[in-house]
């Protein structure tokens, strides 16, 4: 009468799912910290660096009390997609100076991509509403000079580090509320 039915599909434990996402986020945080330090060693930053195309900060001490899982994951995914785009742009248009950050910058890009896939999977497993497909983002203009590329790298890695730092704290907090 055909093969016996397989074992019943166990629905994933949301805390375990979130745990593995936290681990990936922490790991990427450590990678970003290391790469930012490497960049500072090679090209010391003079003051603060900003890039208008980067996402604005989404979390702070005041926002933690009102955190909701769907909102956090949706926003985090959107911000990380933006950072992925900026890292790709940096590798393509950042100039020869930034080639000295390879292969680490490539590794960072691959791990960021992996975390994004993990977030997407987590959202579908938790049956959270899927965000609409991202509208095509306007292309990023190439840096005006070699120093412009280095300043952009400081801003991108600094912003990504801060975003991941808050993401770890927010995800840890949400885990306790599940």
């Amino acid at each position: 009468p055909g093969p016996p039915p397989g074992p019943p599909r166990v629905s994933p434990d949301p805390r375990a799912e979130l745990d593995s996402t936290v681990l990936l986020t922490r790991s990427l945080l450590a990678d970003t910290r290391q790469l930012a330090a490497q960049l500072r060693d090679k090209f010391p930053a003079d003051g603060d660096h900003n890039l208008d195309s980067l996402p604005t900060l989404a979390m702070s001490a005041g926002a933690l009390g009102a955190l909701q899982l769907p909102g956090v994951l949706t926003r985090l995914r959107a911000d990380l997609l933006s950072y992925l785009r900026h890292v790709q742009w940096l590798r393509r248009a950042g100039g020869s100076s930034l080639k000295t950050l390879e292969p680490e910058l490539g590794t960072l890009q691959a791990r960021l991509d992996r975390l994004l896939r993990r977030l997407q999977l987590l959202m579908s497993r938790l049956a959270l509403p899927q965000p609409p497909p991202d509208p095509p983002a306007p292309p990023l203009a190439p840096p005006s000079s070699a120093w412009g590329g280095i300043r952009a790298a400081h801003a991108i890695l600094g912003g990504l580090h801060l975003t991941l730092d808050w993401a770890v704290r927010g995800l840890l907090l949400l885990k306790t509320r599940l």
Partner: antibody
Framework: EVQLLESGGGLVQPGGSLRLSCAAS????????MNWLRQAPGKGLEWVAV????????FYADFVKGRFTISRDNSKNTLYLQMNSLRAEDTAVYYC??????????WGQGTLVTVSS | QSVLTQPPSASGTPGQRVTISCSGS????????VNWYQQLPGTAPKLLIY???LLPSGVPDRFSGSKSGTSASLAISGLRSEDEADYYC???????????FGGGTKLTVL
């Protein structure tokens, strides 16, 4: 290089007031939550207050609620702590510190506040 | 009385491995990240470990952190004389809605 420089400490009488300042440089001040912490002579560390990066949210330790007010001016890259109704037990070195997530990654050198008659 | 509990003192000889413990409850260490700070004599505290076991830039990998349940620990291997300092553990506390510290551990290198 990230730098935090506190000022405004000194000797004040019990019941008096003092305003501490913390000048920040070397990073985008408006992106970071900022804190005040303190350390009484020969004692451990105590967290005092935190303010969100845009100044919209503030949290205080129970022992300073209603007496201390944390504020910031992002246009001046400066953090403040207004201390009223000071008590002898508020005597401490006061530190400002930056928070990127759950931790204090950079600290100032501290300013000493002495409350005594 | 500190919310987190640390031994007041610890000691070791150069080259040795020393561990400092920090115990709390589910509202702080159990549910939140643990951070460790080093305070050398006469100086401001410095971040040593964050998110339980991550090292900031510039901190040697002789330092390591771990966490299990409502307890955390800091390990220092290959002890050096310059490690003589006060060490503090810290975590956010959900019930107090603020950051809490341990009382600090004074490490002496014999």
């Amino acid at each position: 290089e990230v730098q935090l420089l506190e000022s405004g400490g000194g000797l004040v009488q019990p019941g008096g007031s003092l305003r501490l300042s913390c000048a920040a440089s070397g990073f985008t001040f408006s992106h970071y939550d900022m804190n005040w912490l303190r350390q009484a002579p020969g004692k451990g560390l105590e967290w005092v207050a935190v303010i969100s990066y845009d100044g919209s949210n503030k949290f205080y330790a129970d022992f300073v609620k209603g007496r201390f007010t944390i504020s910031r001016d992002n246009s001046k890259n400066t953090l403040y702590l207004q201390m009223n109704s000071l008590r002898a037990e508020d005597t401490a070195v006061y530190y400002c510190a930056r928070t990127p997530g759950s931790h204090f990654d950079y600290w100032g050198q501290g300013t000493l506040v002495t409350v005594s008659s | 009385q500190s919310v987190l509990t640390q031994p007041p003192s610890a000691s070791g000889t150069p080259g040795q491995r020393v561990t400092i413990s920090c115990s709390g409850s589910s509202s702080n260490i159990g549910n939140n990240a643990v951070n460790w700070y080093q305070q050398l004599p006469g100086t401001a505290p410095k971040l040593l470990i964050y998110y339980d076991d991550l090292l900031p830039s510039g901190v040697p990998d002789r330092f390591s952190g771990s966490k299990s349940g409502t307890s955390a620990s800091l390990a220092i291997s290959g002890l050096r004389s310059e490690d003589e300092a006060d060490y503090y553990c810290s975590a956010w506390d959900d019930s107090l809605n603020g950051v809490v510290f341990g009382g600090g551990t004074k490490l002496t290198v014999l």
